[in-house]
Structure formats: structure tokens, C-alpha cells
């Protein structure tokens, strides 16, 4: 068990052109929240899938009000760490998503507004108990700087928080085969639960349920002493017939240490001394490289051949972010002015304007619209000092509260009769005409002009226009 800790250092405009406007305005202050989601392994799961390792939310950030005319600075951050407790072993490799949310404060139509300012994601290798790792991620024009670490909760220790530590029973040394718990030198590593019956004096285990023998002992439970009187070598697996040690491989034979690590034998097994940038029992854990496949969504990884050199993901069209983890969010360019809420609908951008503003990008300041709302999706537009609504299809009236008569525009051609219907309008065509709006003449021989009448409808039947 342990805790993943995230410290946000700064959130603000990234370097280069296209600096974002401040997310808050003088008229409408706001504050930020950060949300972190963790998943085990180098997961390719969608951002919306459950946070299997855990999730956490920051405290509320301080209220921030933009200074008119000033560039967007780094924004005031919530106090404290984001902490994600984990109950089981730390997986070593994990995926993270960090979201920055904005809460607009103050009275406004439709209630308080929440919006996602930025979402960054990545995949990392991290050993528990190690130092803080620093990171910078960009989302659109925003830049997030943060540090993170995983630490074990006592009595757990180790790079996966699977080893247990207990206070020493004797003041000077730990029990047979047990190491001091660095950095807690006054504690000793507690034995794992080995195979039932495994000799506590002559056996040990590195994985639960196994039983490995110290030198001089053999058998499934390490209870059989090995005779060395007529042996050539002082180590090796026991011969089934003589009980004598025959030459066998030592724990460092073949060098189990990866990535250039050097091996040294210990009374229990072996120990690897790892080169810079690697860690783990066999120096198998390193910084993320292109070999780890850090680029999502078909991104091309370049560089990063070794842990000390950075990799770069070249993203395919439609994706962005340090790891191509983010669909291009056109809202990140903040196209909606005057505090409008941006919605990326896929096929189009939509700006939901605050009261007092209108236009496709909320660019029109409508003092006469302030505090007024147009119902049913209508838009308030400037009307020479008077409040006027441009109503969505099917609605009319000063505030778009009245259902418009769909027949008012006389949509039925060639003398067809129009009937209002709950789903639109219906045209009853005059003899000799057909179609949704009676636009097609029926030929004298009974064949209609294109398009043909749908099955089951005779020419001249009323046709519903949806």
C-alpha cells in the first residue's frame, strides 16, 4: 500500500505565439480545480474509462480576477498535494490524466459554469520510494508544470511497496537473511510469507509461496542438509543420489543485471548495482523511451533512444499533446470571446455566450441584452438599443417563447394545404402534385417525376415533411 503524490507547480500560458486569454474576466471571476486520474500499466484506455489506480481532486484554488489589459499570468493554484492512495502493489508503470477545470463565480443565467480548460496525459515508469519526478505537459496554448512520486505507507517498502518492514527485535542486527530497511535503518525487512513449512532458518523467498534454500541446505522446504565431504565445489544444487553439492550456476552467473548493471552475490541471492537512469531488482526499470511506445493514437515516436534523452511524439492529424493523447480541441484556442463557453461538437464549434454578448464567437457586446435571455435556443442580438431575439427554427415571439406556426411561410407548393403537426408540418397536395411540399407534378400516365413516392404512399396523399 502507498500513496501517489502530485504537486502542481504552475498552470499558465505556454511559450511561443498564440498565448491564451485569461480564463477569468474582470466581470466574472473564477477559480481552478485540478483532477488526476491514474491507471495501471501503459494503458491505451480512453480518458473517460475508470481510474483503476485511483483519482484525486485538488482543493479549490483562490478566486482569480483578470486585470484588464494584462497578459494571462500563471494562475493562482490550490494549496497542497493531490494524493491518490493505492491499496495493492505499486505497478511501476502507469498512465495519468491531469485535468484543469474552471469554475466561474458570480450570478449568471443558467447557474454557475464549469468548463475543462486543459487535459494532459502521459505514460510513465516510476519506482515507489524514489525522488520526485518533474514533468512539463502542454495542452493547446496552456502549459502545466508538475512533480510526482509514489511512496510506500509503513510497513511497506520497496520499489513496488510489496516488502514489509518491522521494528528490530535486536538492537544490533536483523534476523538471519533479513536486510535493514533503507532508509529506515532501525527497522528490518519482514519475511515474506513463504511456502508453508519452508525452513525459517535455512529457506527464504523472494515471491510469496516459494522456498529457496541458503547454501548448505536442500529439499523442497530447505530442511535437508547437504554433505560437502566429497565434493569438488562448495556450491550448487544438490545431487539427488549423493546429497553432495555438484558444481552449478552461481546467482551472478550469466549476469542477471540488465542495462549494464553489475552483479554481486549476497548470502541470500544477488544484488545489482545499476547505471544512472536505471533501477529495479535487475536494473530493468528505466525512464520512458520510444521502446515503451509512449505515443497514443498512432503517433510517431522520435528520439528517446535512452532514458536521458527526451522523446518527441509526432501526432497524426486530429491529435495533439505531448503523447498525442488528446483529440485536437479547437476550444483550447479560446475562440469564444467575452467569457463565452466553447463547445466542440465535432462537426462544428459552438459558443454559448454570456448574457450581454452575441455572435458566432460572442464578439458582439449587447448592453441591451444584458440580463435578458432568449428561450428555446434563441440568440439575443443587438437591435438599436432594444432587446431582440433571433429565434431557433419553430419558435417566435419577443423571447422565442411562442411556438412559431410552421405553416406561416406557406411551404406547400401548387395549392397544397398545410397542417401543423407535432413533428413539423404536413402538406396535403392538390390533385396532380406530390412530394413533401407538393413540389413534384404527377405525370398523366401515373408515373411521377423524381423522386418516386415512398412505398405505400399514393400520389396526392398527404406527405409529412420532417
Amino acid at each position: 500500500a502507498g500513496v501517489f503524490e502530485l504537486q502542481i507547480h504552475s498552470f499558465g500560458p505556454g511559450p511561443g505565439p498564440g498565448a491564451p486569454r485569461s480564463p477569468c474576466s474582470a466581470r466574472l471571476p473564477c477559480r481552478l480545480f485540478f483532477r488526476v486520474c491514474l491507471k495501471p500499466g501503459l494503458s491505451e484506455e480512453a480518458a473517460e474509462s475508470p481510474c483503476a489506480l485511483g483519482a484525486a481532486l485538488s482543493a479549490r484554488g483562490p478566486v482569480y480576477t483578470e486585470q484588464p489589459g494584462a497578459p494571462a499570468p500563471d494562475l493562482p493554484l490550490p494549496d497542497g498535494l493531490l494524493q491518490v492512495p493505492f491499496r495493492d502493489a505499486w505497478p511501476g508503470t502507469f498512465s495519468f490524466i491531469i485535468e484543469t477545470w474552471r469554475e466561474e463565480l458570480g450570478d449568471q443565467i443558467g447557474g454557475p459554469a464549469w468548463s475543462l480548460l486543459a487535459r494532459v496525459a502521459g505514460r510513465r515508469r516510476l519506482a515507489a520510494g524514489g525522488p520526485w519526478a518533474r514533468d512539463i505537459q502542454r495542452a493547446g496554448a496552456w502549459e502545466l508544470r508538475f512533480s510526482y512520486r509514489a511512496r510506500c505507507e509503513p510497513p511497506a517498502v520497496g520499489t513496488a511497496c510489496t516488502r514489509l518492514c518491522r521494528p528490530r527485535s535486536a538492537p544490533s542486527r536483523c534476523g538471519p537473511g533479513l536486510r535493514p530497511c533503507a532508509p529506515l535503518e532501525d527497522e528490518c525487512e519482514a519475511p515474506l510469507v513463504c511456502r508453508a513449512g519452508c525452513s525459517p532458518e535455512h529457506g527464504f523467498c523472494e515471491q510469496p509461496g516459494e522456498c529457496r534454500c541458503l547454501e548448505g541446505w536442500t529439499g523442497p522446504l530447505c530442511t535437508v542438509p547437504v554433505s560437502t565431504s566429497s565434493c569438488l565445489s562448495p556450491r550448487g544444487p544438490s545431487s539427488a543420489t549423493t546429497g553432495c553439492l555438484v558444481p552449478g550456476p552461481g546467482p551472478c552467473d550469466g549476469n542477471p543485471c540488465a542495462n549494464g548493471g553489475s552483479c554481486s552475490e549476497t548470502p541470500r541471492s544477488f544484488e545489482c548495482t545499476c547505471p544512472r537512469g536505471f533501477y529495479g531488482l535487475r536494473c530493468e526499470v528505466s525512464g520512458v523511451t520510444c521502446a515503451d511506445g509512449p505515443c497514443f493514437n498512432g503517433g510517431l515516436c522520435v528520439g528517446g533512444a535512452d532514458p536521458d534523452s527526451a522523446y518527441i511524439c509526432h501526432c497524426p492529424p486530429g491529435f495533439q499533446g505531448s503523447n498525442c493523447e488528446k483529440r485536437v480541441d479547437r476550444c483550447s484556442l479560446q475562440p469564444c470571446r467575452n467569457g463565452g463557453l466553447c463547445l466542440d461538437l465535432g462537426h462544428a464549434l459552438r459558443c454559448r455566450c454570456r448574457a450581454g454578448f452575441a455572435g458566432p464567437r460572442c464578439e458582439h457586446d449587447l448592453d441591451d441584452c444584458a440580463g435578458r435571455a432568449c428561450a428555446n435556443g434563441g440568440t439575443c442580438v443587438e437591435g438599436g438599443g432594444a432587446h431582440r431575439c433571433s429565434c431557433a427554427l419553430g419558435f417566435g415571439g419577443r423571447d422565442c417563447r411562442e411556438r412559431a406556426d410552421p405553416c406561416a411561410a406557406r411551404p406547400c407548393a401548387h395549392g397544397g394545404r398545410c397542417y401543423a403537426h407535432f413533428s413539423g408540418l404536413v402538406c396535403a397536395c392538390a390533385p396532380g402534385y406530390m412530394g413533401a411540399r407538393c413540389e413534384f407534378p404527377v405525370h398523366p400516365d401515373g408515373a411521377s417525376a423524381l423522386p418516386a413516392a415512398p412505398p405505400g404512399l399514393r400520389p396526392g396523399d398527404p406527405q409529412r415533411y420532417l
Epitope: F33, R35, E48, S49, P50, A55, L57, W101, E103, Q108, I109, G110, G111, P112, A113, W114, S115, L116, C331, L341, C342, L343, R352, G377
Partner: nanobody
């Protein structure tokens, strides 16, 4: 997709209480916002109370502040609306709604994509 089923509506005298429940199923992990809305006959649908599911933040319409409380049980994927001090003007069809989008006005029904079928609340004087 997210499926929402409301329950707990009914008839009550003015000053009484009701507790509405909204059980969510489907891709509930993607719903950032859940709330209660109501529509009285001949009136527009209006926001009553909403919460940010992962932040324990709430918003209430002025007309219900101090009387209604929205809460959730994450383990059961259920959102509740405790309604105390009910008034005849609270009579309406109450709908549960959810939004998975990343920009929401908490009491604006136009920003919520998923809706239940509704449960009727009638308050008599």
C-alpha cells in the same frame, strides 16, 4: 450511453417532504455533472439542483435554496433530491439529467445530454 431512472415522486401536502432517487447505468464514469430539473404544465423546463459528480460541488435554483438538498451515492451510481418544506408551486414533473460534456452551466437544461423519463411531484395546499 447513460440510462437514468427516476423514482420517489408522489402527492404530498404543503410543508411535507419527498425524496427523489435517480439510478444511473451505462457509461456512468463519463458523467461529470448530474442534476434535477422540473417542468410544470405550460412552463419551460428549469434547473432545480445539480452536482459536479467528482467534486462534491452543488448548485441550486434560488427558489429551492435551503429547502432542497442534492446528494449522491457513488457506489450505487445514484443521485438523490431531498425536498423539504414543499410548496404548491413545486408541483411539476421532475427529471434527472446527466452531462458528460466539458462545458456546462449547472442549471441550464440545454447543456445536459442524458435524461430520465421523469417522476411526478404534486403538492396540494
Amino acid at each position: 450511453q447513460v440510462r437514468l431512472v427516476e423514482s420517489g415522486g408522489g402527492s404530498v401536502q404543503a410543508g411535507g417532504s419527498l425524496r427523489l432517487s435517480c439510478a444511473a447505468s451505462g457509461s456512468t464514469y463519463s458523467t461529470n455533472f448530474m442534476g434535477w430539473f422540473r417542468q410544470a404544465p405550460g412552463k419551460e423546463r428549469e434547473g432545480v439542483a445539480t452536482l459536479v459528480t467528482w467534486a462534491e460541488r452543488t448548485a441550486y435554483a434560488d427558489s429551492v435554496k435551503g429547502r432542497f438538498t442534492i446528494s449522491q451515492d457513488r457506489a450505487k451510481n445514484t443521485v438523490y433530491l431531498q425536498m423539504n418544506g414543499l410548496k404548491p408551486e413545486d408541483t411539476a414533473m421532475y427529471y434527472c439529467a446527466a452531462a458528460a460534456s466539458t462545458a456546462v452551466r449547472l442549471l441550464d437544461p440545454g447543456d445536459f445530454a442524458y435524461w430520465g423519463q421523469g417522476t411526478q411531484v404534486t403538492v396540494s395546499s
